[in-house]
Interface confidence: low
Amino acid sequence: EKLPKAPVITTPLETVDALVEEVATFMCAVESYPQPEISWTRNKILIKLFDTRYSIRENGQLLTILSVEDSDDGIYCCIANNGVGGAVESCGALQVKMKPKITRPPINVKIIEGLKAVLPCTTMGNPKPSVSWIKGDNALRENSRIAVLESGSLRIHNVQKEDAGQYRCVAKNSLGTAYSKLVKLEVEVFARILRAPESHNVTFGSFVTLRCTAIGIPVPTISWIENGNAVSSGSIQESVKDRVIDSRLQLFITKPGLYTCIATNKHGEKFSTAKAAATVSIAEWSKSQKDSQGYCAQYRGEVCDAVLAKDALVFFNTSYRDPEDAQELLIHTAWNELKAVSPLCRPAAEALLCNHLFQECSPGVVPTPMPICREYCLAVKELFCAKEWQAMEGKAHRGLYRSGMHLLPVPECSKLPSMHRDPTACTRLPYLDYKKENITTFPSITSSRPSADIPNLPASTSSFAVSPAYSMT
C-alpha cells in the first residue's frame, strides 16, 4: 500500500505569452498521494470550474484559456492540496501580446495659422507600440515646433501654412504595424493686405485707379469704402491667383475722398478683416474751392436718376453736413406729394424739382451751379401745373402748411436768369424741350397748353410737399 505523500509541484508555472483570441495554457504537474485537489486563481481570485472561458483538464493540472482577451493578463496560480502536509502553490504570469491597434485615430482639422494643432492618435498593444507620423509620403521629422507626445498625439505649435497636408499615424510593435486613415490638416490664414492702395493728388475730373492686394485662406473678399460709405460709383476689377486677391477700383474724381480697402475672410463662424486706406485729393483744390458753397460730382442717388442727364455733373451744397445725403433726402421728401398731381403736371414738376435741387455744375476753379432758366420754371408754374400751383398758394394763404416746410426745393421763378439774356447761364429742362411743339412762346404762354399725352416719368415711392415760403410769381 502506498504511503501518503504531500503534494509536490514538479513543473512550476512559467510566464506565458499569448496573442489576443489565441489559446493560452498553464501546466501545473503535481506528484502526491492521494491524488490532490487542484484549484486555480487569477490575481488571487478563484477561477470557477464552470466558467466557460476556461478548460480545466488532467485532474486539474492543465488550465486553458480558450480565447485570450487583453483583460486576461495577470498572475495565475495553481494550488494543490491532498490533506497530507500543507497546500502547495506555483504562480506564473500571462502576458497578453497584442498587435498595435489605433483606438483613437486622428481626424480632419482646420486650424488658424499661428495657433496650436493637436492630431490625436491613441493606441493599444503589447508591447506598447511606438507611434510615428507620416506627412504626405514622408516620415515626419520632429522639431521644437512639431512633437509626438507620449500619448501618440501629434502637437504642432505655431501652425504654419506649410504644415497643411495629409497626415497619418503609424503604431508599431514587435507583432505588427497599424496605420490610421489619412487625415487633412487645413491651415486657415487671417486676411492680410499685401499691397495697400496708394494716395493720389490729381486734377479735377481725372480718372484714378486704386489697387489693393490681399492674401488669406480662404481667399478673402475685398470691398471698398468711400468716406465711410460703400463706394457707389467707379468700376471694380478683381482677379484671384494662388490665394491672393487683387482688386482695382477706378474712379472719376470730382471731390476729395478717403478710400478704404477692406479684406475679409471667414473662419468657422468668425470673420477676420484687414483694412488699408488711401486719400484722393484734388490738386488746385484751393482755398476758394474749400470755401465755396459746394462741389461738383456725378449724381448717385435714386429719386432723380431717370430725370437727370446720365453721368452729368451736379452741384452739391456744402452748407449741409453731408450734401449728397441731405439733398437726396430733400427730394425724397418732395416726391410723394407729386402722386396727387395730374399726369400733365407730374413729369414737369419732377423735372423742375430735380434740376433745381441737383443743378448742373461747371467744375472750374470755383464749382458753380447753373440754375434753371426762368422760362422753363414759368412754363411748369403757369402751363403744366397751373391748377396745382394755385391750389397750393390758396392752402398756404389759409395757413394749411407749417412754416417748417420752407426748406423744400421749389424755385422762385422770378429770381431765375432768363435764357434770352445768356443762354449759357441757365439750364434748360430737357423734358420740356421734348414738348416744344406744343409750347410756341416763352414766357407768356397762357393760351397755348401742352396736350395731355405727356408720358409719365418712372413712378417713385418718395414724397413731396410744396412750400409756400417761395413766391411763385
Epitope: 521644437s144 515646433r145 509626438v148
Partner: antibody, heavy 118, light 108 residues
Framework: QVQLVQSGAEVKKPGASVKVSCKAS????????MHWVRQAPGQGLEWMGW????????NYAQKFQGRVTMTRDTSISTAYMELSRLRSDDTAVYSC???????????WGQGTMVTVSS | SYVLTQPPSVSVAPGQTARITCGGN??????VHWYQQKPGQAPVLVVY???DRPSGIPERFSGSNSGNTATLTISRVEAGDEADYYC???????????FGTGTKVTVL
C-alpha cells in the same frame, strides 16, 4: 510645485568632459522639451540645444555640434547635458529650461557653474 | 544664422518709461519673448509671444513687435526693475532658439 533642480558646481581640466543633470518635478517630464542654455561670466545667454524627453530626439546649436550630448532618464524625470573636450572658454553657468505649453522658457533650473581651468 | 541686436544699456529715472528694442530681419513675423535676469539669478520670463504676460508679471511690462523691431516697454519704472533684459525668438529656418545680445537697464 513645478521646478528644475540641477547638480552642483564642477571644476574640470581642459580636454575633460562634464555631465550636468536636471531633475524635473511638478509636471509631466515627458510632455515638454528640455533646453540647455549657458552664460559665460559677464556675457549673454546662449542656447545650446534641446531634447524631447518622450522620444529622446535632440537638436543642437551648430556651435556645439559634435561636443554636446543630451540624454534623459524618464524613470527619474531627469535630463542630462554632457559637454566634452572642454576648453577654458567653456567656463560658464549651464542651465536647463523648459516651456510648459508655450514656446518660451517659463521654468529654469538654478544653474550649474562649470569652471574649466588647468 | 539669425541675429538679434539690442542696445547695450538703457538708463531711466524712477516712474518714467523704459523702452528696450530688439532688432532682427523681419522679426515682426516671429514670436518674441523677453526675459529679466538679475545678478546671480536665473532668467525670468516677463513677456512671451510678443505681448502676453505670464501670471505674476506686473502690467507695467508690455511688448510689441512689427517690421524689423520688437520692443519691451516698462512703464512707471521701479528700482527693482534694474536688471539685464534679453529678447529671444525661435528661428524656423534652422529650428534653433536665438537670444538677443542683452540690455542692461539702470534705474537712476
Amino acid at each position: 510645485q513645478v521646478q528644475l533642480v540641477q547638480s552642483g558646481a564642477e571644476v574640470k581640466k581642459p580636454g575633460a568632459s562634464v555631465k550636468v543633470s536636471c531633475k524635473a518635478s511638478g509636471y509631466t517630464f515627458t510632455g515638454y522639451y528640455m533646453h540647455w542654455v549657458r552664460q559665460a561670466p559677464g556675457q549673454g545667454l546662449e542656447w545650446m540645444g534641446w531634447i524631447n524627453p518622450h522620444s529622446g530626439g535632440t537638436n543642437y546649436a551648430q556651435k556645439f555640434q559634435g561636443r554636446v550630448t543630451m540624454t534623459r532618464d524618464t524613470s527619474i524625470s531627469t535630463a542630462y547635458m554632457e559637454l566634452s573636450r572642454l576648453r577654458s572658454d567653456d567656463t560658464a553657468v549651464y542651465s536647463c529650461a523648459s516651456g510648459l505649453g508655450i514656446s518660451a522658457f517659463d521654468i529654469w533650473g538654478q544653474g550649474t557653474m562649470v569652471t574649466v581651468s588647468s | 544664422s539669425y541675429v538679434l541686436t539690442q542696445p547695450p544699456s538703457v538708463s531711466v529715472a524712477p516712474g518714467q518709461t523704459a523702452r528696450i528694442t530688439c532688432g532682427g530681419n523681419n522679426i515682426g513675423s516671429k514670436s518674441v519673448h523677453w526675459y529679466q535676469q538679475k545678478p546671480g539669478q536665473a532668467p525670468v520670463l516677463v513677456v512671451y509671444d510678443d505681448s502676453d504676460r505670464p501670471s505674476g508679471i506686473p502690467e507695467r511690462f508690455s511688448g510689441s513687435n512689427s517690421g524689423n523691431t520688437a520692443t519691451l516697454t516698462i512703464s512707471r519704472v521701479e528700482a527693482g526693475d534694474e536688471a539685464d533684459y534679453y529678447c529671444q525668438v525661435w528661428d524656423s529656418s534652422s529650428d534653433h532658439y536665438v537670444f538677443g545680445t542683452g540690455t542692461k537697464v539702470t534705474v537712476l
